[in-house]
Protein backbone atom coordinates (compact mmCIF):
# COMPACT_ATOMS: atom_id res chain seq x y z
CA UNK A 1 0.00 0.00 0.00
CA UNK A 2 2.79 2.39 0.97
CA UNK A 3 4.58 1.81 -2.34
CA UNK A 4 1.43 2.51 -4.36
CA UNK A 5 0.82 5.70 -2.36
CA UNK A 6 4.42 6.87 -2.77
CA UNK A 7 4.37 6.13 -6.49
CA UNK A 8 0.99 7.77 -7.02
CA UNK A 9 1.96 10.85 -5.02
CA UNK A 10 5.25 11.07 -6.88
CA UNK A 11 3.38 10.96 -10.16
CA UNK A 12 0.89 13.68 -9.13
CA UNK A 13 3.61 15.95 -7.71
CA UNK A 14 5.67 15.53 -10.90
CA UNK A 15 2.61 16.18 -13.04
CA UNK A 16 1.96 19.47 -11.21
CA UNK A 17 5.65 20.33 -11.46
CA UNK A 18 5.85 19.72 -15.20
CA UNK A 19 2.65 21.69 -15.78
CA UNK A 20 4.34 24.52 -13.85
CA UNK A 21 7.51 24.25 -15.94
CA UNK A 22 5.43 24.48 -19.13
CA UNK A 23 3.52 27.46 -17.72
CA UNK A 24 6.73 29.22 -16.66
CA UNK A 25 8.32 28.64 -20.08
CA UNK A 26 5.31 30.18 -21.82
CA UNK A 27 4.89 33.12 -19.43
CA UNK A 28 5.89 36.63 -20.49
CA UNK A 29 6.88 37.81 -17.01
CA UNK A 30 10.39 36.40 -16.70
CA UNK A 31 11.67 39.88 -16.06
CA UNK A 32 9.64 42.94 -15.15
CA UNK A 33 10.58 46.58 -15.15
CA UNK A 34 12.02 47.72 -11.85
CA UNK A 35 9.90 50.63 -10.67
CA UNK A 36 12.09 51.58 -7.71
CA UNK A 37 13.73 54.50 -9.52
CA UNK A 38 10.63 55.44 -11.52
CA UNK A 39 7.46 54.46 -9.70
CA UNK A 40 5.38 56.94 -11.71
CA UNK A 41 5.95 55.53 -15.17
CA UNK A 42 2.90 55.37 -17.43
CA UNK A 43 4.51 52.56 -19.43
CA UNK A 44 5.42 49.18 -17.94
CA UNK A 45 7.81 46.74 -19.61
CA UNK A 46 8.11 43.02 -19.05
CA UNK A 47 9.85 40.25 -20.94
CA UNK A 48 9.67 36.51 -21.44
CA UNK A 49 11.76 33.87 -23.19
CA UNK A 50 9.89 34.32 -26.45
CA UNK A 51 8.68 37.93 -26.57
CA UNK A 52 8.79 41.29 -24.83
CA UNK A 53 5.69 43.23 -23.84
CA UNK A 54 4.78 46.82 -23.03
CA UNK A 55 1.68 47.61 -21.01
CA UNK A 56 0.50 51.20 -21.15
CA UNK A 57 -1.41 52.65 -18.23
CA UNK A 58 -4.35 53.16 -20.57
CA UNK A 59 -4.70 49.38 -20.64
CA UNK A 60 -3.19 48.64 -24.03
CA UNK A 61 -0.61 45.86 -24.13
CA UNK A 62 1.69 45.27 -27.07
CA UNK A 63 3.91 42.21 -27.33
CA UNK A 64 6.64 41.60 -29.88
CA UNK A 65 8.27 38.23 -30.49
CA UNK A 66 12.01 37.78 -30.76
CA UNK A 67 12.02 37.00 -34.47
CA UNK A 68 15.75 36.39 -34.57
CA UNK A 69 17.79 33.47 -33.34
CA UNK A 70 21.30 34.65 -34.02
CA UNK A 71 20.71 38.12 -32.57
CA UNK A 72 19.67 36.84 -29.16
CA UNK A 73 22.10 36.53 -26.24
CA UNK A 74 23.64 33.07 -25.81
CA UNK A 75 22.42 32.95 -22.20
CA UNK A 76 18.81 33.38 -23.31
CA UNK A 77 19.24 30.59 -25.83
CA UNK A 78 20.71 28.40 -23.09
CA UNK A 79 17.75 29.10 -20.79
CA UNK A 80 15.31 28.26 -23.59
CA UNK A 81 17.18 25.01 -24.25
CA UNK A 82 17.20 24.02 -20.57
CA UNK A 83 13.48 24.68 -20.20
CA UNK A 84 12.60 22.76 -23.38
CA UNK A 85 14.80 19.81 -22.37
CA UNK A 86 13.10 19.88 -18.97
CA UNK A 87 9.65 19.82 -20.56
CA UNK A 88 10.54 17.03 -23.03
CA UNK A 89 12.13 14.84 -20.33
CA UNK A 90 9.23 15.52 -18.01
CA UNK A 91 6.66 14.65 -20.67
CA UNK A 92 8.44 11.37 -21.49
CA UNK A 93 8.76 10.68 -17.77
CA UNK A 94 5.02 11.18 -17.33
CA UNK A 95 4.27 8.83 -20.20
CA UNK A 96 6.56 6.14 -18.80
CA UNK A 97 5.27 6.58 -15.25
CA UNK A 98 1.64 6.14 -16.31
CA UNK A 99 2.46 2.58 -17.47
CA UNK A 100 4.60 2.04 -14.37
CA UNK A 101 1.82 2.87 -11.91
CA UNK A 102 1.05 -0.13 -9.72
CA UNK A 103 -2.64 0.65 -9.73
CA UNK A 104 -2.79 0.25 -13.52
CA UNK A 105 -2.72 -3.29 -14.94
CA UNK A 106 -1.30 -3.68 -18.44
CA UNK A 107 -1.33 -7.25 -19.70
CA UNK A 108 0.98 -9.49 -17.71
CA UNK A 109 3.58 -6.84 -16.92
CA UNK A 110 5.82 -8.04 -14.13
CA UNK A 111 6.62 -6.05 -11.01
CA UNK A 112 10.27 -5.94 -12.02
CA UNK A 113 9.33 -4.21 -15.30
CA UNK A 114 7.15 -1.72 -13.43
CA UNK A 115 10.00 -1.11 -11.02
CA UNK A 116 12.40 -0.37 -13.87
CA UNK A 117 9.88 1.98 -15.50
CA UNK A 118 9.25 3.73 -12.18
CA UNK A 119 12.99 4.23 -11.72
CA UNK A 120 13.37 5.49 -15.30
CA UNK A 121 10.54 8.01 -14.91
CA UNK A 122 11.89 9.08 -11.52
CA UNK A 123 15.32 9.80 -12.97
CA UNK A 124 13.67 11.70 -15.85
CA UNK A 125 11.67 13.80 -13.41
CA UNK A 126 14.78 14.56 -11.38
CA UNK A 127 16.73 15.66 -14.48
CA UNK A 128 13.67 17.62 -15.71
CA UNK A 129 13.38 19.45 -12.39
CA UNK A 130 17.11 20.18 -12.36
CA UNK A 131 16.92 21.56 -15.92
CA UNK A 132 14.09 23.90 -14.94
CA UNK A 133 15.83 25.06 -11.76
CA UNK A 134 19.07 25.56 -13.69
CA UNK A 135 17.31 27.50 -16.48
CA UNK A 136 15.49 29.79 -14.10
CA UNK A 137 18.64 30.31 -12.02
CA UNK A 138 20.75 31.18 -15.08
CA UNK A 139 18.12 33.73 -16.10
CA UNK A 140 17.96 35.16 -12.57
CA UNK A 141 21.74 35.48 -12.51
CA UNK A 142 21.59 37.26 -15.88
CA UNK A 143 19.05 39.72 -14.45
CA UNK A 144 21.12 40.41 -11.35
CA UNK A 145 24.22 41.00 -13.47
CA UNK A 146 22.39 43.37 -15.81
CA UNK A 147 20.67 45.14 -12.93
CA UNK A 148 23.96 46.29 -11.49
CA UNK A 149 25.58 47.18 -14.78
CA UNK A 150 25.74 50.95 -14.83
CA UNK A 151 26.45 51.35 -18.55
CA UNK A 152 23.62 52.74 -20.63
CA UNK A 153 24.60 50.70 -23.69
CA UNK A 154 23.88 47.22 -22.45
CA UNK A 155 21.78 44.25 -23.33
CA UNK A 156 18.51 44.16 -21.50
CA UNK A 157 19.05 40.46 -21.39
CA UNK A 158 16.35 39.83 -23.97
CA UNK A 159 16.35 41.41 -27.37
CA UNK A 160 19.89 42.68 -27.30
CA UNK A 161 18.68 46.19 -28.01
CA UNK A 162 20.84 49.15 -27.13
CA UNK A 163 19.12 51.38 -24.62
CA UNK A 164 19.26 55.11 -24.65
CA UNK A 165 17.70 55.29 -21.22
CA UNK A 166 18.53 52.47 -18.88
CA UNK A 167 15.47 50.45 -17.92
CA UNK A 168 16.30 48.08 -15.11
CA UNK A 169 14.58 44.73 -14.84
CA UNK A 170 13.89 42.62 -11.81
CA UNK A 171 12.59 39.09 -11.17
CA UNK A 172 9.26 38.34 -12.80
CA UNK A 173 6.56 35.93 -11.65
CA UNK A 174 7.72 33.24 -14.10
CA UNK A 175 10.99 32.83 -12.20
CA UNK A 176 9.19 31.92 -8.99
CA UNK A 177 6.78 29.63 -10.86
CA UNK A 178 9.80 27.96 -12.49
CA UNK A 179 11.68 27.46 -9.23
CA UNK A 180 8.67 25.98 -7.45
CA UNK A 181 7.71 23.82 -10.45
CA UNK A 182 11.27 22.55 -10.84
CA UNK A 183 11.39 21.74 -7.13
CA UNK A 184 8.09 19.84 -7.30
CA UNK A 185 9.26 17.84 -10.32
CA UNK A 186 12.48 17.02 -8.50
CA UNK A 187 10.60 15.90 -5.37
CA UNK A 188 8.20 13.85 -7.50
CA UNK A 189 11.17 12.16 -9.16
CA UNK A 190 12.76 11.31 -5.83
CA UNK A 191 9.44 9.83 -4.66
CA UNK A 192 9.25 7.68 -7.79
CA UNK A 193 12.78 6.41 -7.16
CA UNK A 194 11.87 5.57 -3.56
CA UNK A 195 8.73 3.76 -4.78
CA UNK A 196 10.87 1.81 -7.23
CA UNK A 197 12.87 0.28 -4.37
CA UNK A 198 9.69 -1.07 -2.85
CA UNK A 199 8.50 -2.48 -6.16
CA UNK A 200 11.67 -4.33 -7.11
CA UNK A 201 11.81 -7.99 -5.96
CA UNK A 202 15.31 -9.01 -4.80
CA UNK A 203 17.04 -11.57 -6.96
CA UNK A 204 18.80 -13.37 -4.03
CA UNK A 205 16.40 -16.32 -3.70
CA UNK A 206 18.04 -19.18 -1.81
CA UNK A 207 17.75 -22.74 -3.08
CA UNK A 208 16.23 -24.73 -0.29
CA UNK A 209 17.23 -28.26 0.54
CA UNK A 210 14.22 -30.35 1.52
CA UNK A 211 14.42 -33.36 3.72
CA UNK A 212 11.32 -35.51 3.59
CA UNK A 213 10.32 -37.57 6.59
CA UNK A 214 7.29 -39.77 6.83
CA UNK A 215 4.22 -37.94 8.09
CA UNK A 216 5.62 -34.48 7.89
CA UNK A 217 8.15 -32.37 6.03
CA UNK A 218 10.79 -30.16 7.51
CA UNK A 219 12.73 -27.87 5.22
CA UNK A 220 16.10 -26.45 6.14
CA UNK A 221 18.08 -23.60 4.73
CA UNK A 222 21.76 -24.24 4.11
CA UNK A 223 22.63 -22.47 7.33
CA UNK A 224 20.65 -24.96 9.34
CA UNK A 225 17.93 -22.42 10.15
CA UNK A 226 14.47 -23.95 10.35
CA UNK A 227 12.51 -22.03 7.75
CA UNK A 228 9.18 -23.75 7.57
CA UNK A 229 7.32 -26.67 9.02
CA UNK A 230 4.27 -27.98 7.31
CA UNK A 231 1.66 -30.39 8.65
CA UNK A 232 -1.00 -32.13 6.68
CA UNK A 233 -1.18 -33.82 3.32
CA UNK A 234 -0.12 -30.85 1.18
CA UNK A 235 3.53 -30.96 2.03
CA UNK A 236 5.00 -32.37 -1.14
CA UNK A 237 7.54 -30.23 -3.01
CA UNK A 238 7.27 -27.46 -0.47
CA UNK A 239 9.19 -24.44 -1.66
CA UNK A 240 10.88 -21.97 0.59
CA UNK A 241 10.92 -18.30 -0.52
CA UNK A 242 13.32 -15.81 0.83
CA UNK A 243 12.55 -12.57 -0.95
CA UNK A 244 14.12 -10.29 1.61
CA UNK A 245 12.22 -7.41 3.18
CA UNK A 246 8.70 -7.10 1.81
CA UNK A 247 6.00 -4.51 2.01
CA UNK A 248 2.32 -5.13 2.56
CA UNK A 249 1.84 -4.97 -1.21
CA UNK A 250 3.98 -8.04 -1.84
CA UNK A 251 2.67 -10.07 1.07
CA UNK A 252 -0.66 -10.28 -0.76
CA UNK A 253 1.06 -12.24 -3.55
CA UNK A 254 1.75 -15.17 -1.22
CA UNK A 255 -1.54 -16.14 0.35
CA UNK A 256 -0.54 -19.51 1.87
CA UNK A 257 -0.48 -19.44 5.66
CA UNK A 258 2.43 -21.86 5.63
CA UNK A 259 4.74 -19.57 3.65
CA UNK A 260 6.79 -17.53 6.08
CA UNK A 261 9.15 -14.80 5.01
Amino acid sequence: MAVTACQGLGFVVSLIGIAGIIAATCMDQWSTQDLYNNPVTAVFNYQGLWRSCVRESSGFTECRGYFTLLGLPAMLQAVRALMIVGIVLGAIGLLVSIFALKCIRIGSMEDSAKANMTLTSGIMFIVSGLCAIAGVSVFANMLVTNFWMSTANMYTGMGGMVQTVQTRYTFGAALFVGWVAGGLTLIGGVMMCIACRGLAPEETNYKAVSYHASGHSVAYKPGGFKASTGFGSNTKNKKIYDGGARTEDEVQSYPSKHDYV
Partner: antibody, heavy 117, light 113 residues
Protein backbone atom coordinates in the same frame (compact mmCIF):
# COMPACT_ATOMS: atom_id res chain seq x y z
CA UNK B 1 -19.87 56.55 -30.89
CA UNK B 2 -17.58 57.71 -28.07
CA UNK B 3 -18.89 60.71 -26.18
CA UNK B 4 -17.88 62.53 -23.00
CA UNK B 5 -19.83 65.35 -21.35
CA UNK B 6 -18.73 67.40 -18.34
CA UNK B 7 -21.28 68.88 -15.96
CA UNK B 8 -21.25 70.77 -12.68
CA UNK B 9 -21.73 74.17 -11.09
CA UNK B 10 -20.28 77.05 -13.05
CA UNK B 11 -19.58 79.10 -9.93
CA UNK B 12 -17.79 77.97 -6.77
CA UNK B 13 -16.88 80.05 -3.72
CA UNK B 14 -13.26 80.21 -2.55
CA UNK B 15 -12.25 77.51 -0.01
CA UNK B 16 -15.17 75.31 -1.09
CA UNK B 17 -14.95 72.03 -3.00
CA UNK B 18 -15.36 71.98 -6.75
CA UNK B 19 -17.32 68.92 -7.94
CA UNK B 20 -17.60 67.95 -11.58
CA UNK B 21 -19.07 64.92 -13.33
CA UNK B 22 -18.06 63.40 -16.66
CA UNK B 23 -20.76 61.22 -18.22
CA UNK B 24 -19.45 58.90 -20.89
CA UNK B 25 -20.89 56.58 -23.54
CA UNK B 26 -19.63 54.43 -26.37
CA UNK B 27 -16.84 52.64 -24.51
CA UNK B 28 -16.23 50.40 -21.51
CA UNK B 29 -15.24 52.18 -18.31
CA UNK B 30 -13.13 49.22 -17.24
CA UNK B 31 -11.13 49.16 -20.48
CA UNK B 32 -10.04 52.80 -20.70
CA UNK B 33 -8.74 55.52 -18.47
CA UNK B 34 -10.26 58.99 -18.18
CA UNK B 35 -8.15 62.08 -17.56
CA UNK B 36 -9.16 65.47 -16.25
CA UNK B 37 -7.48 68.51 -17.78
CA UNK B 38 -8.04 72.20 -17.13
CA UNK B 39 -7.29 75.36 -19.05
CA UNK B 40 -7.30 78.75 -17.33
CA UNK B 41 -8.72 81.51 -19.58
CA UNK B 42 -6.17 82.49 -22.24
CA UNK B 43 -3.58 79.99 -20.97
CA UNK B 44 -2.32 76.53 -21.77
CA UNK B 45 -3.49 73.05 -20.81
CA UNK B 46 -2.80 71.61 -17.35
CA UNK B 47 -3.17 67.90 -16.62
CA UNK B 48 -4.99 67.28 -13.31
CA UNK B 49 -5.12 63.52 -13.00
CA UNK B 50 -6.42 60.24 -14.36
CA UNK B 51 -8.41 57.23 -13.27
CA UNK B 52 -7.59 54.02 -15.10
CA UNK B 53 -9.81 51.12 -16.07
CA UNK B 54 -8.70 49.11 -13.04
CA UNK B 55 -9.68 51.96 -10.71
CA UNK B 56 -6.15 53.15 -9.94
CA UNK B 57 -5.46 56.88 -10.02
CA UNK B 58 -2.59 59.27 -10.70
CA UNK B 59 -2.64 62.96 -9.85
CA UNK B 60 -0.55 65.99 -10.66
CA UNK B 61 2.03 66.48 -7.92
CA UNK B 62 0.96 70.09 -7.34
CA UNK B 63 -2.70 69.12 -6.80
CA UNK B 64 -2.39 65.73 -5.12
CA UNK B 65 -3.41 66.98 -1.67
CA UNK B 66 -6.62 68.57 -2.98
CA UNK B 67 -7.85 66.33 -5.78
CA UNK B 68 -9.89 63.12 -5.90
CA UNK B 69 -11.03 61.33 -9.05
CA UNK B 70 -13.53 58.48 -8.81
CA UNK B 71 -15.80 56.39 -11.02
CA UNK B 72 -19.38 55.17 -10.77
CA UNK B 73 -19.65 52.36 -13.32
CA UNK B 74 -23.38 51.89 -12.78
CA UNK B 75 -24.00 55.46 -13.96
CA UNK B 76 -21.17 55.55 -16.52
CA UNK B 77 -19.81 58.59 -14.72
CA UNK B 78 -16.44 59.88 -13.58
CA UNK B 79 -16.18 62.58 -10.97
CA UNK B 80 -13.58 65.17 -10.05
CA UNK B 81 -13.42 66.80 -6.65
CA UNK B 82 -11.03 69.67 -5.97
CA UNK B 83 -11.03 71.01 -2.43
CA UNK B 84 -10.06 74.40 -1.00
CA UNK B 85 -10.38 76.19 -4.32
CA UNK B 86 -8.99 79.65 -5.00
CA UNK B 87 -9.30 82.09 -7.90
CA UNK B 88 -6.32 80.30 -9.53
CA UNK B 89 -8.56 77.26 -10.03
CA UNK B 90 -10.83 79.20 -12.41
CA UNK B 91 -10.61 77.35 -15.73
CA UNK B 92 -12.38 75.34 -18.37
CA UNK B 93 -12.35 71.74 -17.11
CA UNK B 94 -12.19 68.90 -19.64
CA UNK B 95 -12.49 65.15 -19.28
CA UNK B 96 -10.86 62.99 -21.95
CA UNK B 97 -10.44 59.31 -22.68
CA UNK B 98 -6.94 57.82 -22.61
CA UNK B 99 -6.28 55.48 -25.52
CA UNK B 100 -3.29 54.10 -27.41
CA UNK B 101 0.04 55.50 -26.28
CA UNK B 102 -1.79 56.95 -23.24
CA UNK B 103 -2.88 59.72 -25.61
CA UNK B 104 -6.18 61.50 -25.03
CA UNK B 105 -8.16 60.52 -28.11
CA UNK B 106 -11.67 61.77 -27.22
CA UNK B 107 -12.45 64.97 -25.30
CA UNK B 108 -15.56 66.45 -23.76
CA UNK B 109 -16.61 69.98 -24.73
CA UNK B 110 -15.42 71.34 -21.41
CA UNK B 111 -17.18 73.27 -18.65
CA UNK B 112 -16.13 76.65 -17.34
CA UNK B 113 -15.81 76.86 -13.57
CA UNK B 114 -15.33 80.26 -11.99
CA UNK B 115 -14.09 80.57 -8.43
CA UNK B 116 -15.44 83.79 -6.98
CA UNK B 117 -17.15 85.02 -3.84
CA UNK C 1 8.24 66.09 -13.06
CA UNK C 2 9.09 66.15 -16.75
CA UNK C 3 9.10 69.70 -18.12
CA UNK C 4 7.89 70.16 -21.68
CA UNK C 5 9.19 73.23 -23.53
CA UNK C 6 7.66 74.30 -26.84
CA UNK C 7 9.14 76.75 -29.31
CA UNK C 8 8.40 79.14 -30.79
CA UNK C 9 5.54 80.54 -28.72
CA UNK C 10 4.00 81.88 -31.90
CA UNK C 11 4.53 81.08 -35.55
CA UNK C 12 3.30 82.85 -38.73
CA UNK C 13 3.46 80.90 -41.99
CA UNK C 14 2.03 81.59 -45.45
CA UNK C 15 -0.69 79.36 -46.85
CA UNK C 16 0.77 76.37 -48.66
CA UNK C 17 4.10 76.75 -46.88
CA UNK C 18 5.72 74.36 -44.43
CA UNK C 19 5.19 75.00 -40.71
CA UNK C 20 7.56 73.45 -38.18
CA UNK C 21 7.40 73.63 -34.40
CA UNK C 22 9.55 72.08 -31.70
CA UNK C 23 8.97 70.37 -28.37
CA UNK C 24 11.72 69.46 -25.92
CA UNK C 25 11.38 67.33 -22.79
CA UNK C 26 13.57 67.49 -19.72
CA UNK C 27 13.85 63.68 -19.72
CA UNK C 28 13.83 61.09 -22.46
CA UNK C 29 10.38 59.87 -23.51
CA UNK C 30 11.78 56.84 -25.32
CA UNK C 31 10.65 53.53 -23.89
CA UNK C 32 13.30 50.85 -24.42
CA UNK C 33 10.77 48.02 -24.29
CA UNK C 34 9.12 48.89 -27.61
CA UNK C 35 11.43 51.65 -28.87
CA UNK C 36 8.52 54.11 -28.93
CA UNK C 37 8.54 57.71 -27.83
CA UNK C 38 5.60 58.58 -25.61
CA UNK C 39 5.00 62.05 -26.93
CA UNK C 40 1.62 63.27 -28.17
CA UNK C 41 0.62 66.31 -30.26
CA UNK C 42 -2.76 68.06 -29.97
CA UNK C 43 -4.41 70.80 -31.99
CA UNK C 44 -6.77 73.25 -30.28
CA UNK C 45 -8.85 75.69 -32.25
CA UNK C 46 -10.47 78.69 -30.51
CA UNK C 47 -13.50 77.74 -28.41
CA UNK C 48 -12.99 74.02 -28.98
CA UNK C 49 -11.48 71.18 -26.96
CA UNK C 50 -8.08 69.90 -28.06
CA UNK C 51 -7.95 67.27 -30.81
CA UNK C 52 -5.48 64.39 -30.93
CA UNK C 53 -3.17 64.62 -33.94
CA UNK C 54 -0.19 62.36 -33.31
CA UNK C 55 0.79 59.83 -30.64
CA UNK C 56 3.99 57.81 -30.14
CA UNK C 57 5.74 60.92 -31.55
CA UNK C 58 5.06 59.95 -35.17
CA UNK C 59 1.86 57.89 -35.44
CA UNK C 60 -1.02 59.84 -36.96
CA UNK C 61 -4.43 59.43 -35.38
CA UNK C 62 -7.05 58.12 -37.81
CA UNK C 63 -8.76 60.92 -39.73
CA UNK C 64 -5.84 63.33 -39.39
CA UNK C 65 -4.65 64.68 -42.77
CA UNK C 66 -1.30 63.36 -43.93
CA UNK C 67 0.15 66.86 -44.15
CA UNK C 68 0.67 66.54 -40.39
CA UNK C 69 3.74 64.56 -39.41
CA UNK C 70 5.70 64.09 -36.21
CA UNK C 71 9.33 63.20 -35.77
CA UNK C 72 12.09 63.10 -33.20
CA UNK C 73 13.25 60.80 -30.45
CA UNK C 74 14.38 60.92 -26.86
CA UNK C 75 14.03 64.54 -25.80
CA UNK C 76 13.70 66.50 -29.07
CA UNK C 77 10.52 66.36 -31.13
CA UNK C 78 9.08 68.20 -34.11
CA UNK C 79 5.60 68.66 -35.55
CA UNK C 80 5.54 69.54 -39.25
CA UNK C 81 2.65 70.72 -41.38
CA UNK C 82 3.87 70.22 -44.94
CA UNK C 83 1.45 72.61 -46.64
CA UNK C 84 -0.40 75.01 -44.36
CA UNK C 85 -4.16 75.29 -44.84
CA UNK C 86 -6.45 77.98 -43.43
CA UNK C 87 -8.13 75.46 -41.09
CA UNK C 88 -4.77 74.66 -39.48
CA UNK C 89 -4.77 77.95 -37.59
CA UNK C 90 -4.74 76.82 -33.96
CA UNK C 91 -2.62 76.34 -30.86
CA UNK C 92 -0.55 73.14 -30.88
CA UNK C 93 0.38 71.37 -27.66
CA UNK C 94 2.77 68.53 -27.01
CA UNK C 95 2.34 66.20 -24.03
CA UNK C 96 4.54 63.76 -22.15
CA UNK C 97 2.68 60.45 -21.96
CA UNK C 98 5.60 58.51 -20.50
CA UNK C 99 5.82 59.51 -16.88
CA UNK C 100 3.36 60.97 -14.36
CA UNK C 101 2.32 63.72 -14.20
CA UNK C 102 1.48 63.70 -17.91
CA UNK C 103 2.60 67.27 -18.46
CA UNK C 104 1.76 69.53 -21.41
CA UNK C 105 4.01 72.00 -23.18
CA UNK C 106 3.10 75.68 -23.14
CA UNK C 107 1.79 75.54 -26.71
CA UNK C 108 2.71 77.07 -30.08
CA UNK C 109 0.23 79.43 -31.68
CA UNK C 110 0.14 79.00 -35.44
CA UNK C 111 -1.12 81.90 -37.56
CA UNK C 112 -1.26 82.71 -41.26
CA UNK C 113 1.25 85.24 -42.52
Amino acid sequence: QVQLQESGPGLVKPSETLSLTCTVSGFSLTSYGVSWIRQPPGKGLEWIGVIWGDGSTNYHSTLISRVTISVDTSKNQFSLKLSSVTAADTAVYYCARAGRGNALDYWGQGTLVTVSS
Amino acid sequence: DIVMTQSPDSLAVSLGERATMSCKSSQSLLNSGNQKNYLTWYQQKPGQPPKLLIYWASTRESGVPDRFSGSGSGTDFTLTISSLQAEDVAVYYCQNDYSFPLTFGGGTKLEIK
